[in-house]
Interface confidence: low
């Protein structure tokens, strides 16, 4: 099982620092926008962890930005946001739809706005139940 | 411009307690982890812990847990560490940083002494 | 706890120079780990966070290499204002921890 983890670990971690870099690859960065949706987390160990990709940096005032389905809906209360910006694309992971050509990204307006939890323990918590 | 200000050093005796400060401003304080990092005599670093002060969970390294604890007021923008039974193994400056990954910026630190 | 081994302890170069900081961590770290740069009596200041992402106002002759287990900090063009200590440490896992520093003195 440990191996399993680390093998996981090793996959997510790719998949974040490859994000979006690959329009004709999606297939595993929309498994990873998947888990994120479903378990309700962002990133591998915090939301940090997508600052590292370059496509995904804001420099300076510019808002730092994370894949889409790292937002928590129940906090967003911003209907502009939700209507014209995400639910758009989370309608698509909640179908598992496999139609994106790019990822999709979306800015963090505030920090409340995305999971604050990163996915490793509720992961490993599923690892361990499975 | 991000600032994290200290309070000032703090001469303790051997078994006292204190609470050391870090007020925030300059940034969304509920944002950020906020982590606080011991240095001995100039030297080596050590990572007590973090505090997120959005929800207010705490994440302790091992070896300070028990003689640390961290808190925050959301409301003035301000984090806490209380540090117990202090000894002299305690007297070290110690910085709150601030965290996105890693720490991105630092207060002045607050010197603490302890001696009887 | 991941144990962080920082070489050289000190070392000594002249301006313009150029200076390599390296770092071995006991476990992968994948590129969770980052260089600070503390002048005396100041606070540790971010220089390169993910192990090759300059911080904000960090000049470009600092540069960060490596993942997993091996890290390194470059400094290139060396100016007197480079002179201090210099610390690695990673953010992997609880508990984050540091090298040991390198003393950086400008001959």
């Known amino acids: 099982r440990a191996q399993l983890e680390r093998s996981l670990r090793d996959v997510v971690e790719k998949t974040i620092q490859k994000y979006g870099t690959n329009p004709e690859e999606t297939a595993a960065e929309e498994s990873w926008d998947y888990v994120q949706f479903q378990l309700r987390c962002c990133g591998w160990h915090y939301p940090q962890d997508w600052f590292q990709v370059l496509i995904l940096r804001g420099n300076g005032s510019e808002a730092h930005r994370v894949p889409c389905s790292c937002y928590n809906l129940s906090a967003t209360n911003d209907s502009t946001i939700l209507d014209k910006v995400i639910l758009p694309q989370l309608s698509r992971l909640g179908h598992l739809a496999r139609s994106r050509h790019s990822a999709d990204i979306c800015a963090v307006p505030a920090e409340s706005h995305i999971y604050r939890e990163g996915c490793a323990q509720g992961l490993q918590k599923w690892l361990h139940n499975n | 411009a991000v600032q994290l200000q200290q309070s000032g050093p703090e001469l303790e005796k051997p078994g006292a307690s204190v609470k050391i400060s870090c007020k925030a401003s300059?940034?969304?304080?509920?944002?950020?982890?906020m982590n606080w990092v011991k240095q001995n005599n100039g030297k080596s670093l050590e990572w007590i812990g973090n505090?997120?002060?959005?929800?207010?969970?705490?994440t302790y390294n091992r070896k300070f847990k028990g003689k640390a604890t961290l808190t925050v007021d959301k409301s003035s923008s301000t984090a806490y560490m209380q540090l117990k039974s202090l000894t002299s193994e305690d007297s070290a400056v110690y910085y709150c940083?601030?965290?996105?990954?890693?720490?991105?910026?630092w207060g002045q630190g607050t010197s603490v002494t302890v001696s009887s | 706890d991941i144990q962080m081994t920082q070489s050289p302890a000190s070392l000594s170069a002249s301006v313009g120079e150029t200076v390599t900081i390296t770092c071995r961590t006991s476990?992968?770290?994948?590129?969770?780990l980052a260089w600070y740069q503390q002048k005396q009596g100041k606070s540790p200041q971010l220089l390169v966070s993910?192990?090759?992402t300059l911080a904000e106002g960090v000049p470009s002759r600092f540069s960060g290499s490596g993942s997993g287990t091996q890290f390194s900090l470059k400094i290139s063009s060396l100016q007197p204002e480079d002179s201090g200590s210099y610390f690695c440490?990673?953010?992997?896992?609880?508990?984050?921890?540091f090298g040991g520093g390198t003393e950086l003195e400008i001959k």
């Open positions: 440490q990673h953010h992997s896992d609880n508990p984050w921890t």
């Open positions: 476990e992968n770290v994948y590129s969770y």
């Open positions: 505090i997120d002060p959005y929800y207010g969970g705490t």
């Open positions: 940083a601030r965290s996105v990954g890693p720490m991105d910026y």
């Open positions: 993910f192990a090759k």
């Open positions: 300059g940034y969304s304080f509920t944002g950020y982890n």
